[in-house]
């Protein structure tokens, strides 16, 4: 058993049929010695008396809010949560496996630049009685500070018969130099509590590996005189690290006809313009990637040819 | 370390070309190592991230773009800073910092070159003959060093009398390649920045 926060405790249980469970001793936080009784949740049934209560925790029915009273007055509470371990593996029932980039990916994180700011998100099908808390650091043995905000519900989607909820959190490394070469990874730890079930999820990464620039901005077409050709131009996204001559991007330019049968043309360029033959109903799209370290491509910025 | 007296040549273009080749070569070599040594811990997640140039060179600090010298977090470990009287940049200071930056890159390359050559000598003794260093990568390191055109003491190649542990050598190769790729990215950024300015 360990303390998650004040008056909230996590009991770690090996979860299998007829498991013996875990013996837990609760102590009432009071100077009083006599006349103390214990109850669980909303029940008025007295579980025991005395300053301490010894219980055998085997299942969720044994978890919950234990309260010690004296003469009708509440003295203190202890909330017991369960953390299940099945076949030596901690349960992951609360969050959904996103399976990207690999199996058992519950947390996904992205950064728009090298400023040390990043966003992580996760998915669940659970809609109520759910709380998350997020901690982060650079390295684990001698951790350096990363500050995370509160996790918030950022999207709801319908997937088949059930709803899926996306939660996200923003974190910022306390003292980040965009030009630094990372040698210690960022660690992100998410505590998830659903009713009386506790689970924790972790992710470890280098900012350089989770970079995903915003799409190029101001994608524009300028027709060229006496020609079917247009000059396409775009700019670095505002959120990208500066100076751009140091934090350079490379771009993928694509010309796509309306029908899937038409040939798609795609090239890469370090410049922020190109000349394109604009066909009727075609569209021109541009996306960006760090020029020197191949992490994710941005989403496409697109403009119709017409 | 022998710092150059003359201001480095403003024509950064050949260095930019060589640094791009360097990044391509080390990335290809790392990919090859990850594929060939698939049953060894050779991915970014599995290895310890070590920097053989730590405390010996200061490339990131010496080559910091002017715009980032206002960032406190970037200046923490700097012995020298771009910022001079009244946040004004004296041109002599700039050329000195540029020389310091390029000589630091040169020293990095020299250290990695020695490590890679020593390692290759060991890998050539491996009866499995599983992996060797790409000669193209070694050549590209050499070309960039020549383009930087610094003269410094030659570092003797390390020779070892004891029987090499090939497993350890291959893991060290992965560690070195990961670190060198990160440094090659920094070098490319620096060359691109110097070329633009």
């Amino acid at each position: 058993i360990w303390e998650l926060k004040k008056d909230v405790y996590v009991v770690e249980l090996d979860w299998y049929p007829d498991a013996p469970g875990e013996m837990v001793v609760l102590t009432c936080d009071t100077p009083e010695e006599d006349g103390i009784t214990w109850t669980l949740d909303q029940s008025s049934e007295v579980l025991g008396s005395g300053k301490t209560l010894t219980i055998q925790v085997k299942e969720f029915g044994d978890a919950g809010q234990y309260t010690c009273h004296k003469g009708g007055e509440v003295l203190s509470h202890s909330l017991l949560l369960l953390h299940k371990k099945e076949d030596g593996i901690w349960s992951t029932d609360i969050l959904k496996d996103q399976k990207e980039p690999k199996n058992k990916t519950f947390l996904r994180c992205e950064a728009k630049n090298y400023s040390g700011r990043f966003t992580c998100w996760w998915l669940t099908t659970i809609s109520t009685d759910l709380t998350f808390s997020v901690k982060s650091s650079r390295g684990s043995s001698d951790p350096q500070g990363v500050t995370c905000g509160a996790a918030t519900l950022s999207a709801e989607r319908v997937r088949g018969d059930n709803k899926e909820y996306e939660y996200s959190v923003e974190c910022q490394e306390d003292s980040a130099c965009p030009a630094a070469e990372e040698s210690l990874p960022i660690e992100v730890m998410v505590d998830a509590v659903h009713k009386l079930k506790y689970e924790n999820y972790t992710s470890s990464f280098f900012i350089r590996d989770i970079i995903k620039p915003d799409p190029p901005k101001n994608l524009q077409l300028k027709p060229l005189k006496n020609s079917r050709q247009v000059e396409v131009s775009w700019e670095y996204p505002d959120t990208w690290s500066t100076p751009h001559s140091y934090f350079s991007l490379t771009f993928c330019v694509q010309v796509q006809g309306k029908s899937k049968r038409e040939k798609k043309d795609r090239v890469f360029t370090d410049k922020t313009s190109a000349t394109v033959i604009c066909r009727k109903n075609a569209s021109i799209s541009v996306r960006a990637q760090d020029r020197y370290y191949s992490s994710s491509w941005s989403e496409w910025a697109s403009v119709p040819c017409s | 370390r022998n710092l150059p007296v003359a201001t480095p040549d403003p024509g950064m273009f050949p260095c930019l070309h060589h640094s791009q080749n360097l990044l391509r070569a080390v990335s290809n070599m790392l990919q090859k190592a990850r594929q060939t040594l698939e049953f060894y811990p050779c991915t970014s997640e599995e290895i310890d991230h070590e920097d053989i140039t730590k405390d010996k060179t200061s490339t990131v600090e010496a080559c910091l773009p002017l715009e980032l010298t206002k960032n406190e977090s970037c200046l923490n470990s700097r012995e020298t800073s771009f910022i001079t009287n009244g946040s004004c940049l004296a041109s002599r200071k700039t050329s000195f910092m540029m020389a310091l930056c390029l000589s630091s890159i040169y020293e990095d390359l020299k250290m990695y070159q020695v490590e890679f050559k020593t390692m290759n000598a060991k890998l050539l003794m491996d009866p499995k003959r599983q992996i060797f260093l790409d000669q193209n990568m070694l050549a590209v390191i050499d070309e960039l060093m020549q383009a930087l055109n610094f003269n410094s003491e030659t570092v003797p190649q390390k020779s070892s009398l004891e029987e090499p542990d090939f497993y350890k050598t291959k893991i060290k190769l992965c560690i070195l390649l990961h670190a060198f790729r990160i440094r090659a990215v920094t070098i490319d950024r620096v060359m691109s920045y110097l070329n633009a300015s």
Partner: nanobody, 124 residues
Framework: EVQLVESGGGLVQPGGSLRLSCAAS????????MAWFRQAPGKEREFVAT????????DYADSVKGRFTISRDNTKNTVYLQMNSLKHEDTALYYC?????????????????WGQGTQVTVSS
């Protein structure tokens, strides 16, 4: 191995036109970017134009924009450079190049395969 052969060069008066061709053999180049470079006597090789695999996306050097047009015919494995309003400063040896990639590169070091070149002389 890729072979590139340029043709169509010659002597032309200022204001005149020429059409250069670059025929590729040894490999189908319809999936790759192609480029034209030029080199005047005593000068560095300079970028002229480059074209995408299908031929819808191009890039030109500022000095030739609006006067030169790069195009390709993938059925013939050939790339063209239509040069109009020629000037004295366009006099150079014109090279065709590819790197069997998809980058619209503007630096000669980005290309690994080169033709022998075709001479263009603009003189009155």
């Amino acid at each position: 191995e890729v072979q590139l052969v340029e043709s169509g060069g010659g002597l032309v008066q200022p204001g005149g036109s020429l059409r250069l061709s670059c025929a590729a053999s040894g490999r189908t180049l319809s999936s790759y970017t192609m480029a034209w470079f030029r080199q005047a006597p005593g000068k560095e090789r300079e970028f002229v134009a480059t074209i995408s695999p299908v031929g819808f996306i191009m890039d030109y050097a500022d000095s030739v924009k609006g006067r030169f047009t790069i195009s390709r015919d993938n059925t013939k494995n050939t790339v063209y450079l239509q040069m109009n309003s020629l000037k004295h400063e366009d006099t150079a040896l014109y090279y065709c190049a590819t790197d069997l990639g998809r980058k619209l590169g503007t630096q000669s070091c980005e290309y690994g395969y080169w033709g022998q070149g075709t001479q263009v002389t603009v003189s009155s």
